[in-house]
């Protein structure tokens, strides 16, 4: 029950996170005009990954797409790439995790397969979240660098009476959305990985060894299997394999530790 809840919660958290990553990627407010030097401007500038916008006090907003690919800064291209990779991985992760959910029955899919899929989706969510966090952080770092560079420029070369106020940009809403969304996706991924461990408890699999005690004989098989009392009195025919002991009539089959490699 706890495993199902953990898996379900991980899925929901990741879903919200990926929706947030998509929203952040599409948002225009990655950087917004810093109004510290000119708080009474009638024109407000903000920029996204795909276009830059100008909002006038009148309510009119004009946006222009970045129609060049080669003319854009390499950092911006890198941020775009990270966000897109994050979305793609997240989307694939969601698709995989839907089939991995314990509460959803698909044919005669074994729990071992569900555990593998849960782990796969969890890893995908973790990488997706890291991509988003990295992308947003790279952009934020770029903003901070440009902010201080433009601040330095603002106070140099003002010999005359005329002031040329350089537009400085600060953190936009999309950055915070991206950070939170990336974090949620990461948390969701970790939860999926934890759920995977619950779906497939790791076993220590050895060959069954018989210990002969004087008088009353007990065949002890380590690894969580029932020890059958009475030497040679096994009514069930137990086959023993190298790499993992499983009975023919076991209803639930667990993956061995080698399945994770």
């Amino acid at each position: 029950m706890a495993v199902t809840a953990c898996q379900g919660l991980g899925f929901v958290v990741s879903l919200i996170g990926i929706a947030g990553i998509i929203a952040a990627t599409c948002m225009d407010q990655w950087s917004t005009q810093d109004l510290y030097n000119n708080p009474v401007t009638a024109v407000f500038n903000y920029q996204g990954l795909w276009r830059s916008c100008v909002r006038e006090s009148s309510g009119f907003t004009e946006c222009r797409g970045y129609f060049t690919l080669l003319g854009l800064p390499a950092m911006l291209q890198a941020v775009r790439a990270l966000m897109i990779v994050g979305i793609v991985l997240g989307a694939i992760g969601l698709l995989v995790s839907i089939f991995a959910l314990k509460c959803i029955r698909i044919g005669s899919m074994e729990d071992s397969a569900k555990a593998n899929m849960t782990l796969t989706s969890g890893i995908m969510f973790i990488v997706s979240g890291l991509c988003a966090i990295a992308g947003v952080s790279v952009f934020a770092n770029m903003l901070v660098t440009n902010f201080w560079m433009s601040t330095a420029n603002m106070y140099t070369g003002m010999g005359g009476m005329v002031q040329t106020v350089q537009t400085r940009y600060t953190f936009g809403a999309a950055l915070f959305v991206g950070w939170v969304a990336g974090g949620l996706t990461l948390i969701g991924g970790v939860m999926m990985c934890i759920a995977c461990r619950g779906l497939a408890p790791e076993e220590t699999n050895y060959k069954a060894v018989s210990y002969h005690a004087s008088g009353h004989s007990v065949a002890y098989k380590p690894g969580g299997f029932k020890a059958s009392t009475g030497f040679g009195s096994n009514t069930k025919n137990k086959k023993i394999y190298d790499g993992g002991a499983r009975t023919e009539d076991e209803v639930q089959s667990y993956p061995s530790k080698h399945d994770y490699v």
């Epitope: 009474v40 401007t41 024109v43 009148s58 009119f60 222009r64 106020v165 350089q166 537009t167």
Partner: antibody, heavy 116, light 113 residues
Framework: QVQLKESGPGLVAPSQSLSITCTVS????????VHWVRQPPGKGLEWLGV???????NYNSALMSRLSISKDNSKSQVFLKMNSLQTDDTAMYYC??????????WGQGTSVTVSS | DIVMTQSPSSLTVTAGEKVTMTCKSS????????????LTWYQQKPGQPPKLLIY???TRESGVPDRFTGSGSGTDFTLTISILQAEDLAVYYC?????????FGSGTKLEIK
């Protein structure tokens, strides 16, 4: 067609307050902003303030303490209220429609004289 | 506040001549986001309200004759009337509409000989 018409008291005693109404037609106050501008006799234009479609306002910092602009969208009316009038507030008061921060249509103006 | 300085304050010219008047702002009116200069030119004829001539420093308002041309960027702007006509007798004002308060220049009075 777009029209703006100012109506005011004409004569105001010093230290009294001034109320001017700008009645608009041909456009909606929910879509356009309205500016107020005044012009003392024989002098240049002075921007007083603006009310935007959302109802938010911006004022001339020199007059902010005694100036108030409001509107009634349903009646298509914009109101200018100015307190503590002095003789140098004597001017022609205009309202004008905003278009992308420029004033494209102006009213004919209303003359206000501050005198005892 | 942004200070708008117009020159000359008055100008006496003959019909048919080319007229140039300038407007300087104490701060740049160029918005980097859309590369537009938020400067407007108005014409005010005697006894009339002002009339919008040019916005964004160089965009002519519809219905305005093409003899009126606005140019300039940043802090220095010019209004040119290519072939002056008798009906152009007026006062011309430039206005900052980039930063509050929206300040006007003192005007250039155009008189015809």
């Amino acid at each position: 067609q777009v029209q703006l018409k100012e109506s005011g008291p004409g004569l105001v005693a010093p230290s009294q307050s001034l109320s001017i109404t700008c009645t608009v037609s041909g456009f909606s106050l929910t879509s356009y902003g309205v500016h107020w501008v005044r012009q003392p006799p024989g002098k240049g234009l002075e921007w007083l303030g603006v009310i935007w479609p959302g109802g938010n306002t911006n004022y001339n910092s020199a007059l902010m303490s005694r100036l108030s602009i409001s509107k009634d969208n349903s009646k298509s009316q914009v109101f200018l209220k100015m307190n503590s009038l002095q003789t140098d507030d004597t001017a022609m008061y205009y309202c004008a429609r905003d278009r992308r921060l420029a004033m494209d249509y102006w009213g004919q103006g209303t003359s206000v004289t501050v005198s005892s | 506040d942004i200070v708008m300085t117009q020159s000359p304050s008055s100008l006496t010219v003959t019909a048919g001549e080319k007229v140039t008047m300038t407007c300087k702002s104490s701060q740049s009116l160029l918005n980097s986001g859309n590369q537009k200069n938020y400067l407007t030119w108005y014409q005010q004829k005697p006894g009339q309200p002002p009339k919008l001539l040019i916005y964004w420093a160089s965009t002519r308002e519809s219905g305005v004759p093409d003899r009126f041309t606005g140019s300039g960027s940043g802090t220095d702007f010019t209004l040119t009337i290519s072939i002056l006509q008798a009906e152009d007798l007026a006062v011309y004002y430039c206005q900052n509409d980039y930063s509050y308060p929206f300040t006007f220049g003192s005007g250039t009075k155009l008189e015809i000989k």
